[in-house]
Amino acid sequence: SQVSQNCHNGSYEISVLMMGNSAFAEPLKNLEDAVNEGLEIVRGRLQNAGLNVTVNATFMYSDGLIHNSGDCRSSTCEGLDLLRKISNAQRMGCVLIGPSCTYSTFQMYLDTELSYPMISAGSFGLSCDYKETLTRLMSPARKLMYFLVNFWKTNDLPFKTYSWSTSYVYKNGTETEDCFWYLNALEASVSYFSHELGFKVVLRQDKEFQDILMDHNRKSNVIIMCGGPEFLYKLKGDRAVAEDIVIILVDLFNDQYFEDNVTAPDYMKNVLVLTLSPGNSLLNSSFSRNLSPTKRDFALAYLNGILLFGHMLKIFLENGENITTPKFAHAFRNLTFEGYDGPVTLDDWGDVDSTMVLLYTSVDTKKYKVLLTYDTHVNKTYPVDMSPTFTWKNSKLPNDITGRGPQ
């Protein structure tokens, strides 16, 4: 049904969905703090621009009676229930910030006539790609997939002289929300990753993964998994690993690798870690003092969602344009705005671009070192360490298939 938007006459409201089922188990109070900090900044920016308007947020809480799993499994209906609540109250803001679960975002997008923008901290899955009024402020699965294909094909670097065309993917179903959708995208038979690879098998049992590590008949030397070093250790332990195995550990929202006093444990020597360029420090933030790195990124995405809305509001008001139009709803893409932690770039489909960093463990220093960076905006890899001190033979990444070419 058509809901009137509280979005005119100098008063602009943001509807923030505070869902019990969330991509990250973050206390809602922390997200409220992030939103409120963003509102203060937006008000300052509008005031600086000579725009005498009011910007507020309305926090919409679900009752939590039915949808109380706490993770994303029962989020589909919770999102729709919250929309119904907004509809009944006849109180919709200029923009909707909140659904972070892929299930809920997909369903809400599907089931509503969206003439307003939706900003999500999450919604990682491929099913949320290419949505005209959806903006995602945490790296979606598509970006990861494009990096992997780019890296697999690369064969002209001093440390990677072979193109790869094969991979195992470890996915046991206990993953966090981000990892679940990242691996889901790699598993999907119709995805870009699957299309570009000649061989790909999903390992679902711990034993399957453990057996591959020393299996002489394995079909690929490369294994992709998602999580932190502790997750890998629980699975791999101190088991022996064939010398030409390469484990790619996707751990995007974890900047602990860059801390000065961090030493890489021995079990990480066969591992390349894919993470995001550090910098989400939020040093001065009241809401971030006790947050883990992942949750910091989640709270930051909420804050940046508010700043993005403020950026677009300022542009439209300065141009004398109406906010409650499809033009506004479709405008949250193909732009750069000043986020809390630096410039934030959104691609043509409203998805955040970032610099991904591939790390290796130096056998000399036992420290994580940057091997290369990848700019998701231009789909380009930039080598950093031209002579890495790898564990692999000749300090080069091995071929992905044992026995094909010199090892």
Partner: nanobody, 119 residues
Framework: QVQLVESGGGLVQPGGSLRLSCAAS????????MDWYRQAPGKQREMVAT???????TYTDAVKGRFTISRDNAKNTVYLQMNSLKPEDTAVYYC?????????????WGQGTQVTVSS
Amino acid sequence: QVQLVESGGGLVQPGGSLRLSCAASSNIFRAYGMDWYRQAPGKQREMVATIWLSGRTTYTDAVKGRFTISRDNAKNTVYLQMNSLKPEDTAVYYCNAGAPTASSGRQYWGQGTQVTVSS
């Protein structure tokens, strides 16, 4: 009226230190990151360092490891601590704040403070 007031410049010997300050009006300071630029005689103005609202910092390669940018939220002031100064650091240093513009830096500039590194 937005004001950015720089101070702390002066004459210093190579290897010496200086601390520049930039006081800003609160509505600017609390809304945007802030930059230090410099302009040497006969050269173009160049970015030196940025501090974002989060406190994250970025530096040009020429000053990395020698200069430190910081902000004091209680005083609405940004600082540039300059150590191991070199003759090539000689320039007028400008504070830059406000909304980013398409052309040159942010919308507001201070009047600049002269830093001369010479023996």
